[in-house]
């Protein structure tokens, strides 16, 4: 049975596929720059801001050099995942007092979510272990006042540049051992 | 051009033990993970075992576990099926695919049968 | 018993469009996990058909559209023609089994 052997090649090869996850990562590290930079305009931190329900960062750079592909492509899959829950109860819960950072947030969340599924489809060619997502957590709480959810944006949008810069080096690397 | 060759089919008693190739060329090999998927006649596909582009992590179907053995040889270009105490629910056509799979052979036939 | 299910058959006349279903569970289409969708033609190997729920591989014809939500997916094919008359396989990963998982196929008739 079957069509004569040999087919063209109808999808990117995973090595192209890192390539062009990187170049997103990295458009979606500098959406997140800019987006921040607006934040910081419109509302001024006082100080750092921190949000327990976000994930600790991954790695440091230094430390990259040690890991294994599957490690790096899970840890950055479930950071991100957690990251998108947050842009998405942030735009939801904060409707109002941040519509100014409109449409960029909502274009944030679409190219999170789209990162996500680039990662996947290359854990997924490379035949790597693909472990479930954490049980969904419990539901993130409104913030208590407007103040409460600019401190909790800086802390979101904070956090993911710092995920999507470690995400960038740690692609890069992980290229060389494709 | 991806091509995907399989070769090693064959009747087989019960209890006997084939091992499958895949010869691939046309593509980046040792950048896949690489999948054996099989279709006994009349039904539907059924995956069997999977092994990651550095076959440091390999897969079964619970109903080969232990039975077959999924490897690789990227100096070589080829995938590798080692299928031993055949019974004969095992019949059937064994594809070897890559990737998500995206890429299929076109299947070598094993019947199991005395 | 497959672990994604789909219906054994569909059918459509030329030009029509059909929708081919495929249900899961929370340990693979519920997981946030792809959908991929195979073609499999009378006495042929299977062909990437869908991948990544809505992604179409080059030289898939536009008229072939997937979509995903919550625990189950679905294939789309608008203009219905004969040669599209084949076995339709959706696939996802499952964490329970640690491997891909194939729906049972749905046969496609065109009238």
């Known amino acids: 049975p079957g069509p004569p052997p040999g087919s063209p090649r109808a999808s990117p090869d995973p090595r192209a596929e890192l390539d062009s996850t990187v170049l997103l990562t990295r458009s979606l590290l500098e959406d997140t720059r800019q987006l921040t930079i607006q934040l910081k305009d419109k509302f001024p931190a006082d100080g750092d801001h921190n949000l327990d329900s976000l994930p600790t960062l991954a790695m440091s750079a230094g430390a990259l050099g040690a890991l294994q592909l599957p490690s790096v492509l899970t840890r950055l899959r479930a950071d991100l995942l957690s990251y998108l829950r947050h842009v998405q109860w942030l735009r939801r819960a904060m409707g109002s007092s941040l519509k100014t950072l409109e449409p960029e947030l909502g274009t944030l969340q679409t190219r999170l979510d789209r990162l996500l599924r680039r990662l996947q489809l290359l854990m997924s060619r490379l035949a790597l272990p693909q472990l479930p997502p954490d049980p969904p957590a419990p539901p993130l709480a409104p913030p208590s006042s407007t103040w409460g959810g600019i401190r909790a944006a800086h802390a979101i949008l904070g956090g993911l540049h710092l995920t999507l810069d470690w995400a960038v080096r740690g692609l890069l690397l992980l290229k060389t051992r494709l | 051009e991806v091509q995907l060759l399989e070769s090693g089919g064959g009747l087989v008693q019960p209890g006997g033990s084939l091992r499958l190739s895949c010869a691939a060329s046309?593509?980046?090999?040792?950048?896949?993970?690489m999948h054996w998927v099989r279709q006994a006649p009349g039904k539907g596909l059924e995956w069997v075992a999977v092994?990651?582009?550095?076959?440091?992590?390999?897969y079964y179907a619970d109903s080969v576990k232990g039975r077959f053995t999924i490897s690789r040889d990227n100096s070589k270009n080829t995938l590798y099926l080692q299928m031993n105490s055949l019974r004969a629910e095992d019949t059937a056509v064994y594809y070897c695919a890559a990737g998500v799979p995206d890429y299929w052979g076109q299947g070598t036939l094993v019947t199991v049968s005395s | 018993q497959s672990v994604l299910t789909q219906p054994p058959s569909a059918s459509g006349t030329p030009g029509q469009r059909v929708t081919i279903s495929c249900s899961g569970s929370?340990?693979?289409?519920?997981?946030?996990?792809?959908v991929h969708w195979y073609q499999q033609l009378p006495g042929t190997a299977p062909k990437l058909l869908i991948y990544?729920?809505?992604e179409r591989p080059s030289g898939v014809p536009d008229r072939f559209s997937g979509s995903k939500s919550g625990t189950s997916a679905s294939l789309a094919i608008s203009g219905l023609r004969s040669e599209d008359e084949a076995d339709y396989y959706c696939a996802a990963w499952d964490s329970s089994l640690s491997g891909p998982v194939f729906g049972g196929g749905t046969k496609l008739t065109v009238l």
């Open positions: 092994i990651s582009y550095d076959g440091s992590y390999k």
């Open positions: 929370s340990s693979n289409i519920g997981s946030d996990y792809d």
């Open positions: 046309g593509f980046t090999f040792s950048s896949y993970g």
């Open positions: 990544s729920n809505n």
